[in-house]
């Protein structure tokens, strides 16, 4: 057991052109915090895959407000280290993700909002108990400077925190066969419980008599470095004597990946692609629990009470993503009906309705005709958020106050002549055409294109339709 410690030194614009805008402003002051996620081994994993070695969240940094016109400086940082405790052996090789988050503190109804500002990732080798390692990582125009180390928690010591130390029973020396525990010279190595000869640097055990190897080491006592450079074939198990991979069955034979993981061969061995909620070399370990606080922006962590059940984040309205890290443009869902204007106020959506509509989503059609009168015998028709008059023959306009010229729109087709009439209009059709609007040709045999002429009218007669 031990602790991985991360010290953030600075977060600010990187060198070169295109300095980023400050994430904070006078209108929207903000403060930063950091999240670190650790995974064992050197596998290139997606940002969403679980933090198998552990995760930690920093405190909030000091509130920062941009000075108008000034370039974005290094931003004020939270105090203290980020500490990620690990229960088992330190793997020696690990992948990390460090996220910089911004907490907006503007006049937000319903509290602050969080958004991801930058994410850096890397893969490193690191022995526990060693000095601080310094690093610089860039994400877009931002630059993050930090140091990290892994240290063992007593009584564990060694580069993997697998050797145990105990206070000396006698003041002067350790018991038979036991060495002093460097660097704790006043303590003694605890009696070995691993298989005799198991490498104290590259092997460890969880059960008496076993010897399990850290990544990069092989052999029954974990004393042989894995190396493929002088080998003829990249397939098969490691030779305990040379560390070479000798020909043998394919590494994915029998699918070594548990819990529904899929296996793919790599130049050195195999790699498991694990389903959501599982991780590890063989997908044998389940993922982050709710205790790791994976949900942002007020999200509630559901499930994930223990490492065998995957968590889900229930996100507040306005956020989405597996960790509620993405802000949603709720207006893009076009929730306002009948042409209403959508406003996302953060704490709620508002719809500004067009005239004639009301309700939270402009869903109610108001009585457009209330108090409206249509002149000259017209009748009011609702619709479209504004009243409309259906006018009696001979009248037009919004309120049927205008006397209409029924021939103004040239309603008679094929050269027919239009006559205004007290009850509408009459079309006198040109030879060869008939119909109320002269729209039907008369066939040469005297039959018309109409199914039947109205009784009392011969084809070619002027027709008046009331």
């Amino acid at each position: 057991a031990g602790v991985f410690e991360l010290q953030i030194h600075s977060f600010g614009p990187g060198p070169g052109p295109g300095a980023p805008r400050s994430p904070c402003s006078a209108r929207l002051p903000c403060r930063l915090f950091f999240r670190v996620c650790l995974k064992p081994g050197l596998s290139e994993e997606a940002a969403e895959s679980p933090c198998a070695l552990g995760a930690a969240l920093s405190a909030r940094g000091p509130v920062y407000t941009e000075q108008p016109g000034a370039p974005a400086p290094d931003l004020p940082l939270p105090d203290g280290l980020l500490q990620v405790p690990f229960r088992d052996a330190w793997p020696g090789t690990f992948s990390f993700i460090i996220e910089t988050w911004r907490e907006e503190l503007g006049d937000q109804i319903g509290g602050p909002a969080w958004s991801l500002l930058a994410r850096v990732a890397g893969r490193r080798r690191l022995a526990a108990g060693g000095p601080w390692a310094r690093d610089i990582q860039r994400a877009g125009a931002w630059e993050l400077r930090f140091s990290y180390r892994a240290r063992c928690e007593p009584p564990a010591v060694g580069t993997a925190c697998t050797r145990l130390c105990r206070p000396r029973s006698a003041p002067s020396r350790c018991g038979p066969g036991l060495r002093p525990c460097a660097p704790l010279e006043d303590e003694c190595e605890a009696p070995l419980v691993c298989r005799a000869g198991c490498s104290p640097e590259h092997g460890f055990c969880e059960q008496p008599g076993e010897c399990r190897c850290l990544e990069g080491w092989t052999g029954p006592l974990c004393t042989v470095p894995v190396s493929t450079s002088s080998c003829l074939s990249p397939r098969g198990p490691s030779s305990a004597t040379t560390g070479c991979l000798v020909p043998g069955p394919g590494p994915c034979d029998g699918n070594p990946c548990a819990n529904g993981g899929s296996c793919s061969e790599t130049p050195r061995s195999f790699e498991c692609t694990c389903p959501r909620g599982f991780y590890g070399l063989r997908c044998e370990v389940s993922g982050v629990t709710c205790a790791d606080g994976p949900c942002f922006n007020g999200g509630l962590c559901v499930g994930g009470a223990d490492p065998d059940s995957a968590y889900i984040c229930h996100c507040p309205p306005g956020f989405q993503g597996s960790n509620c890290e993405k802000r949603v443009d709720r207006c893009s869902l076009q929730p306002c009906r009948n042409g209403g204007l959508c406003l996302d106020l953060g704490h709620a959506l508002r719809c500004r309705c067009r005239a004639g509509f009301a309700g939270p989503r402009c869903e109610h059609d108001l009585d457009d005709c209330a108090g409206r009168a249509c002149a000259n015998g017209g009748t009011c028709v609702e619709g479209g958020g504004a009243h409309r008059c259906s006018c009696a023959l001979g009248f037009g306009g919004r309120d049927c106050r205008e006397r209409a010229d029924p021939c103004a729109a040239r309603p008679c087709a094929h050269g027919g002549r239009c006559y205004a009439h007290f009850s509408g209009l009459v079309c006198a059709c040109a030879p060869g055409y008939m119909g109320a609007r002269c729209e039907f040709p008369v066939h040469p045999d005297g039959a018309s294109a109409l199914p039947a002429a109205p009784p009392g009218l011969r084809p070619g007669d002027p027709q008046r339709y009331l």
Partner: antibody, heavy 118, light 108 residues
Framework: QVQLQEWGPGLVKPSETLSLTCTVS????????WSWIRQPPGKGLEWIGY???????NYNPSLKSRVTISVDTSKNQLSLKLSSVTAADTAVYYC????????????WGQGTLVTVSS | EIVLTQSPGTLSLSPGERATLSCRAS???????LAWYQQKPGQAPRLLIY???SRATGIPDRFSGSGSGTDFTLTISRLEPEDFAVYYC?????????FGGGTKVDIK
């Protein structure tokens, strides 16, 4: 002004189903999560469950097998059904709105007392 | 589930005095997702504090919240007659949502 009003029978017989409705005014039921909380006489608060209009629900494991929460967006209402009730389910039942900044309760109904007795 | 333990069960004070109420969580509450409510007899609870320290709309500044991790505190700097009530804490870090057992602040 957001207002919530619970209603339903005040007396339910043991082994029957308790049914309550909460009418929401001043806020669209589609914009928030909505929850039910109960408080036995003289005791503390117990969260029952919540719902989002999309159908997402989450119930207290201690009540999960007996609880159903639903919403009717057209009426701006949510409802609670609790089956196989016993005297231990006698309580004041509150509906509440869940805030957008997190899963806490920013508006509450005045509560309705439901007594389970034969 | 996260169990919230409030102490003391009852706090007897006079108007004008300072009240300090404690809420302790059985597991760490991430991101300070903790709220405080006030409840008077025959009424529904009223939100006072969220995010451990942010005052809800319309809450007087004599109410303040603090703490992180497993230990949280609600402080009423000078008790007014209308502040005598029962106070509950609630965590909203993970499901199930849980409340503390309450602290009753009554008049000495």
């Amino acid at each position: 002004q957001v207002q919530l009003q619970e209603w339903g029978p005040g007396l339910v017989k043991p082994s029957e189903t308790l049914s309550l409705t909460c009418t929401v005014s001043g806020a669209s039921i589609s914009s928030f999560y909505w929850s039910w909380i109960r408080q036995p006489p003289g005791k503390g608060l117990e969260w029952i469950g919540y719902i989002y209009y999309s159908g997402t629900t989450n119930y207290n494991p201690s009540l999960k097998s007996r609880v159903t929460i639903s919403v009717d967006t057209s009426k701006n209402q949510l409802s609670l059904k609790l089956s196989s009730v016993t005297a231990a389910d006698t309580a004041v039942y509150y509906c509440a709105r869940i805030a957008v900044a997190g899963f806490f309760f920013d508006y509450w109904g005045q509560g309705t007392l439901v007594t389970v007795s034969s | 589930e996260i169990v919230l333990t409030q102490s003391p069960g009852t706090l007897s004070l006079s108007p004008g005095e300072r009240a300090t109420l404690s809420c302790r969580a059985s597991q760490s509450v991430n991101k300070n997702y903790l709220a405080w409510y006030q409840q008077k007899p025959g009424q529904a609870p009223r939100l006072l504090i969220y995010g451990a320290s942010s005052r809800a709309t319309g809450i007087p500044d004599r109410f303040s919240g603090s703490g992180s991790g497993t230990d949280f505190t609600l402080t009423i700097s000078r008790l007014e007659p209308e502040d005598f009530a029962v106070y509950y804490c609630q965590q909203y870090d993970r499901s199930p949502l849980t409340f503390g057992g309450g602290t009753k602040v009554d008049i000495k």
